[in-house]
Structure formats: C-alpha cells, structure tokens
C-alpha cells in the first residue's frame, strides 16, 4: 500500500506511515503528505537543510536512506515496484533562497527495474518550475558514485555528487551537494533545477512525491 491508500482509509494527517511493497509483506517507512493538492502523496525525496549526505552508493539509493522526518530518499526499488503496478503522477516542489516556490508536475511517472538501472520515464509536464523538463527526456538511467550509467565520458555522480538520472550530465540534480544561503550560486554540483533557476543556483528545499493518477 501507498500513502494514497492510507489516505483513503481515513488516515488524513501528514506524517510517517509504514508502507508495504506490492505483492509482498516487506515494509518501508515513508512520509505521507496528506495536505498538498488533496493529499495522498508518497514522498520519495526530500531536502531541506543538508543534514543528510546524499553522495551514497547504488545499494543505498536502491534501499533508501535518511529519515522520513527530514531529509531522505525512499528507495529506488520500492518506487520502481510501486510505479510498475499503476499509473502514477510525480510532483516536484522546489524552494529557492529568496522565498519563492515552484513545482513541476508529470502526469505519468515510473521507474524501470534495477535491470534497466531504474531508468526514469516521464510524460506530460506542467507547472511553474519551467516549461521544459529539467529531467532530460527521454529518461536516463540512474547513476551513483559506484555505478556510472550516464551518457557522459565523465562520471557525473562522482563529479557532481549524489545519485540521479544523469544525462551528460543533464539539467537537474536534486540530490546534489547542499549549499547554505549566500554560498548557493555558481555551484554546478549543487541542488539544480535548470529550467527554473538556471545553471549554477543551488536550491534551498526540494520534495519529490508521487500519487496514483486516478486518485
């Protein structure tokens, strides 16, 4: 079950809930946002203060790390299995250091399996964080510091920090190095969403959340 099911069961307060893998008894803890846009959102990534190191291994990105109370990555394997069952939408919420907020909404999102390096698939972009997708299209394979699957001769994850769907290296990286205010410009290895804030701006906060399209 996911946060949408939990919401529909009557638990409509945002917080940490135990989710289960599809067709399995395996459990995972996640933050459920029951407030934004009608609720039912499973948060798969959150950055807010730099308290968690996002330069992690393939295994850690597969299984998840951090704390759902703060900064965390839910885990590629769970997200892949979940989004392979039904059609999901992806909402990405962004905050800059000047108090502005923006979002990108994709009307269809799924991750391929590990055998395809958790390649991201996205369609139907709307929102205020750029008219062009800052996640390269068509989707790229996921790369980490110990698993280089990008389209660059270089190793984007090693160079730019964090696991992400790097292209060469691509116009985004929400898992980049966290830079505090006044140190967040001209930082190519920061938390980047190019088509909102440009080439070298590192964001203050990000949230990636998913929900069934038919919610």
């Amino acid at each position: 079950r996911d946060c949408a099911e939990i919401f529909k069961s009557g638990l409509t307060t945002s917080g940490i809930y135990t989710l289960t893998f599809p067709n399995s008894t395996e459990e995972i803890k996640a933050y459920c946002d029951m407030d934004v846009g009608g609720g039912g959102w499973t948060v798969i990534q959150h950055r807010e203060d730099g308290s968690v190191d996002f330069q992690r291994t393939w295994k850690e990105y597969k299984e998840g790390f951090g704390s759902p109370l703060g900064e965390y990555w839910l885990g590629n394997e769970f997200v892949s299995q979940l989004t392979g069952q039904h059609r999901y939408v992806l909402k990405i919420q962004l905050k800059d250091w000047e108090g502005n907020e923006a979002h990108s909404l994709y009307d269809h999102f799924y991750l391929a399996g590990e055998e395809s390096n958790y390649r991201i698939h996205l369609t139907g972009l709307t929102g205020t964080a750029g008219k062009i997708s800052s996640i390269s299209q068509p989707g790229s394979d996921f790369s980490t510091k110990d698993s280089d699957n990008d389209k660059c001769i270089c190793k984007c994850s090693q160079m730019l920090s964090g696991g992400w769907w790097f292209d060469a290296c691509g116009p985004s990286n929400l898992n980049g190095q966290y830079y505090p205010q006044k140190q967040n410009t001209n930082k190519f290895n920061g938390i980047k969403w190019y088509y909102w804030k440009g080439s070298g701006y590192s964001l203050k906060a990000t949230t990636m959340m998913i929900r069934p399209a038919d919610f």
């Epitope: 090693q158 730019l160 060469a168």
Partner: antibody, heavy 122, light 107 residues
Framework: EVQLLESGGGLVQPGGSLRLSCAAS????????MSWVRQAPGKGLEWVSV????????YYADSVKGRFTISRDNSKNTLYLQLNSLRAEDTAVYYC???????????????WGQGTLVTVSS | DIQMTQSPSSVSASVGDRVTITCRAS??????LAWYQQKPGKAPKLLIY???SLQSGVPSRFSGSGSGTDFTLTISTLQPEDFATYYC?????????FGGGTKVEIK
C-alpha cells in the same frame, strides 16, 4: 568520431569584425555546453567564452566582454563567435571546444577543433 | 580572477623518467582542475579532469592529484610521445583560467 571544424578566421584591421563558425559532428551537439578558447602566437591558452546547451546562458572573459558574442544553432550543429571592435591583442588561434558536460559553469574541454587564426593588424 | 601558477616552466627529461609538474591556484578551487597536453601546431588534449579523473583513452602513466590550491600531474614513465607542453586549468569559477604551461623537453 567527434569533429569540430572552425572557419571564418583571417586578417582584419583594428576596430573591424569577424564571425567565426564551428561545425560540429559525431556527437549530440544540443546536449553539450560549448566554448571558445584562444592562443596567441607562442603564448598560452586563454578561455574566451562558454554557452549553455540551449544558448540561454553565456559567459565571457573580461578581456572580450562587450565585444564578442557567442551563439549556437542546435538545428545546424554549429557554434559561432562574433568578434567586434577587434584589437591587436586579439590576434590568436581560436579553438572551438566541446565541453565534457553540459554544465556551463564547469568547463573541461574534451574535444577541440583544429583552430582558426585571427590576425588583427593594420 | 583565480591565478594559476605552474612550475617548472620547463623540464628536461629522458625517456623512462618520472616527471612531476605542479600547479598552484591563488585560492581554493576544491578539486575542479584539469590538465591538458599540447604538441606544437596541434590543439590541446584533455588528460585529467576533476583533479584526478583520467580522461578516456589516456594512458595510465598519467595521473593527477591534489585539492584546494596545490595540484600535481605525474608521468610515471616518460615516453617519446610525451614530450609536449602541459597546461593546468581551473574549472571552479568564472573566468576559467589556465596556467602558463610547462614544457617537457628531451634531455
């Protein structure tokens, strides 16, 4: 095979203008930041300018700011450098350069053209 | 602007020698440094990026190290084709700047 072919160099008088072109092939041009680097005769390398994949972000060395303009046409796989108000100190071989990544704020050049010579003299 | 200072400006060496070239930045550039090789009349060639990452196709006798302000390019066993001029370049901040070059000559 990646190829970068510059053209447009030549002899020009001080105060004059030139437009350099760089035809790119062998890679997905629209996915990479592109740069111009120059080298005066017998001297070292000097970075001139870089442009983002979309062309929306451009940066210049102080020595050419306000005089040179970098641009690109992704439909033609071509990079340009417009040189105006040329000075004797602009005399150099101008290299078209493919960046290792698409990150305009981090220039590592992994492929270079053969260079085109610009001579500014009266 | 960040100034990049290479030393020595030239070095005489023999085939088989170990050659070390240093590059110093005027301020902290973390690991955002590249090394290039240039032969007379030719375009430069990328050897090392991000201080120590070997560019694809470059022989393993070339290696880079350092971070912050002090960097080193080492050629472990000099080959005849390695006689050239070597440049460092910082990629930390605009404007991107090169060192003055180190010419490796035949002794």
């Amino acid at each position: 095979e990646v190829q970068l072919l510059e053209s447009g160099g030549g002899l020009v008088q001080p105060g004059g203008s030139l437009r350099l072109s760089c035809a790119a092939s062998g890679f997905t041009f629209r996915k990479y930041a592109m740069s111009w680097v120059r080298q005066a005769p017998g001297k070292g390398l000097e970075w001139v300018s870089v442009i983002s994949v979309s062309g929306g972000n451009t940066y210049y060395a102080d020595s050419v700011k306000g005089r040179f303009t970098i641009s690109r046409d992704n439909s033609k796989n071509t990079l340009y450098l417009q040189l105006n108000s040329l000075r004797a100190e602009d005399t150099a071989v101008y290299y078209c350069a493919k960046d290792l990544t698409d990150i305009v704020l981090m220039v590592y050049v992994d492929y270079w053209g053969q260079g085109t010579l610009v001579t500014v003299s009266s | 602007d960040i100034q990049m200072t290479q030393s020595p400006s030239s070095v005489s060496a023999s085939v088989g020698d170990r050659v070390t070239i240093t590059c110093r930045a005027s301020q902290d550039i973390d690991r955002w440094l590249a090394w290039y090789q240039q032969k007379p009349g030719k375009a430069p060639k990328l050897l090392i990026y991000a201080a120590s990452s070997l560019q694809s196709g470059v022989p393993s006798r070339f290696s880079g190290s350092g971070s912050g302000t002090d960097f080193t390019l080492t050629i472990s066993t000099l080959q005849p084709e390695d006689f050239a001029t070597y440049y460092c370049q910082q990629a930390n901040s605009l404007p991107f700047t090169f060192g003055g070059g180190t010419k490796v000559e035949i002794k």
